[in-house]
Amino acid sequence: IAAHVISEASSKTTSVLQWAEKGYYTMSNNLVTLENGKQLTVKRQGLYYIYAQVTFCSNREASSQAPFIASLCLKSPGRFERILLRAANTHSSAKPCGQQSIHLGGVFELQPGASVFVNVTDPSQVSHGTGFTSFGLLKL
Amino acid sequence: IAAHVISEASSKTTSVLQWAEKGYYTMSNNLVTLENGKQLTVKRQGLYYIYAQVTFCSNREASSQAPFIASLCLKSPGRFERILLRAANTHSSAKPCGQQSIHLGGVFELQPGASVFVNVTDPSQVSHGTGFTSFGLLKL
Amino acid sequence: IAAHVISEASSKTTSVLQWAEKGYYTMSNNLVTLENGKQLTVKRQGLYYIYAQVTFCSNREASSQAPFIASLCLKSPGRFERILLRAANTHSSAKPCGQQSIHLGGVFELQPGASVFVNVTDPSQVSHGTGFTSFGLLKL
């Protein structure tokens, strides 16, 4: 069971990143699915290595003082969502913006029907060029 | 099937990074090989988690305006190479240069004879000290 | 065999990061253990994907000129410790400090009784908020 999905620019104002089965994507079988273009949902309980990479372009003067934060989050059936992993990068002083990349990854127990998704502080800063931003998992 | 190889400084002007089976490297068996010191080639079709880490040292004034970009690329038999993953980091203002590290990783389907390699915008900026720059894969 | 542990602030002056089985941690069975809150120790020989993520907050003026370095290290029975992976990030000019995240990961052969741990140049700069700093492994 494995998946690797590709970032998709979105006109939605949500902080949850959007993904698509496009380009050189992976979706090994129907035991993992991409739901609503925003979350990877698994059918089998078990340990999974889950990862995300986010490239963004921001400028210190044009952004809030808070850093750019990417969060890998879990939503299990009947439970509140929770943060599994986070990474933070202070905005660049480069103009018009400076690119930076974040990588998150870890091993987590997922229940049947559990979903994982990626949240960022400012989705408008995310880079969607080939290979820059992706999200995936593999069952151990 | 797994491999982990260590960066090697090169006098070549190519943007493809060079690697060696040295230090604490891994080469599990002959189903994965390091070819020409530049690419990991697999003999078996399947899903692989492929990763690379690149540490580099650059300075904004001494570099081009474009960021430092590391790309994980795939070359399948009879096909053009394609980009699997990329990460970008704007150059530092630190002098003489500022170190930064990039990590790339994802799950991809590889065909028999497929090769993966790492390309960077400026190989002269890559750090080759122990543990700083490495490349590997594992078959799921 | 898999583990994922969560960073723990420590009053110790050691450069070795401290970890805990808290929050959404993973400890699959007793073939991997967290020892003294500082190292993951395995009982079985084999290939392991080992990873760490460290988020830190630093300022160029308040820090030494040397970059922030995170190292993934190995201690095998009867042998000296050795560095497996390192990542380096130059300090930010943001005030009071600028956050940055480092991710390390690779495939390594571990012997029975081998331990892996994470070393940083300045543990006081490490961020311990939910999800920011973690450490884990999985047996292939």
């Epitope: 060029g129 080939t130 290979g131 | 394609r82 | -």
Partner: nanobody, 123 residues
Amino acid sequence: EVQLLESGGGLVQPGGSLRLSCAASGFTFVAYPMAWVRQAPGKGLEWVSTIAPLGGNTYYADSVKGRFTISRDNSKNTLYLQMNSLRAEDTAVYYCAKRPEGLQIDSQNFDYWGQGTLVTVSS
């Protein structure tokens, strides 16, 4: 929106040289193979040359081999065709074309084209 804009065409004497350029925008240039295709007056399309995404591999039609050189500058999102030892039969409209990712090298599929630039070889 994908855009390909050719330039550099013109009138040149036999044996002369020209350099065509193609400025690309609206896609990740470095990720795609690129090609030059030409159409002589009253004739069909003829593939001229293709270059791999990272520029390491190049391919040429037999009719131009040894005279034409394809190249690319991924930092400038620009494709080039250096044409030397030009002949009357090289007279054509030259099109810059983008190929999809992942196709076989010998496939001649193109998903985007420029408007073309006219090259006339005449004394």
